[in-house]
């Protein structure tokens, strides 16, 4: 039975050329996290594997940085980065949990950032 829940940064906005941290947090379960995948629509951005560490997809290696924690930092944002992002937690024995974040990259210098939280 899957009892866990994913908390995310929700809907966020950022300024073109800036950077943003995408974060998810899995709670209410004792399941072991074996891997976290970060995806944009159907495109893999990064993997954080418990044994192998971080992998950043070759096409994003210049603009994506691992962390903080299991989160992901997107840099040098462009308007094309606007869209849905997914954190996919692979756990044992629960299975897979998925969180969704919507990022809007604004041309304006007035970009309102959504609420954030710190993972202890």
């Amino acid at each position: 039975m899957m009892t866990g829940t994913i908390e995310t940064t929700g809907n966020i906005s950022a300024e073109k050329g800036g950077s943003i941290i995408l974060q998810c947090h899995l709670s209410s379960t004792t399941a072991q996290v074996t891997q976290v995948n970060w995806e944009q629509q159907d495109q893999l951005l990064a993997i954080c594997n418990a044994d192998l560490g971080w992998h950043i997809s070759p096409s994003f290696k210049d603009r994506v940085a691992p962390g903080p924690g299991l989160g992901l930092t997107l840099q040098s944002l462009t308007v094309n980065d606007t869209g849905e992002y997914f954190c996919i937690y692979h756990t044992y024995p629960d299975g897979t949990y998925t969180g969704r974040i919507f990022l809007e990259v604004l041309e304006s210098s007035v970009a309102e950032h959504g609420a954030r939280f710190q993972i202890p």
Epitope: N49, L52, W54, H55
Partner: nanobody, 116 residues
């Protein structure tokens, strides 16, 4: 400079199998994991599978899970990718990398074409 040579590609019918090899002039690992990647025409290069240098852990792209198997033989400085139940969408040039996250050296790749 480390040389990587991929081989084993070819033309295969859907449902068929191939075994790719990656031979390195030095250690097949430069980090804690090595990987196989592929690049289809008009698409970005993407991770297919990775294996830790202890061979105790593996990672697979969702699209190949249950069909592909990665392995490595440290004594031969060679890595392998066993590909079963091939699909037309597996058609691509396949590359290996000594570190699944630091793309310092690429081989010339080996072309896999899945077509009837």
């Amino acid at each position: 400079e480390v040389q990587l040579v991929e081989s084993g590609g070819g033309l295969v019918q859907p449902g068929g199998s191939l075994r790719l090899s990656c031979a390195a002039s030095g250690s097949i690992f430069s980090g804690n994991a090595m990987g196989w990647f592929r690049q289809a025409p008009g698409k970005e290069r993407e991770l297919v599978a990775a294996i830790s240098n202890s061979a105790s852990s593996t990672v697979y792209a969702d699209s190949v899970k249950g069909r592909f198997t990665i392995s490595a033989d440290n004594s031969k400085n060679t890595a392998y990718l066993q590909m079963n139940s091939l699909k037309p969408e597996d058609t691509a040039v396949y590359y290996c990398a000594r570190d699944w996250n630091l793309f310092d050296y690429w081989g010339q790749g080996t072309l896999v074409t899945v077509s009837s």
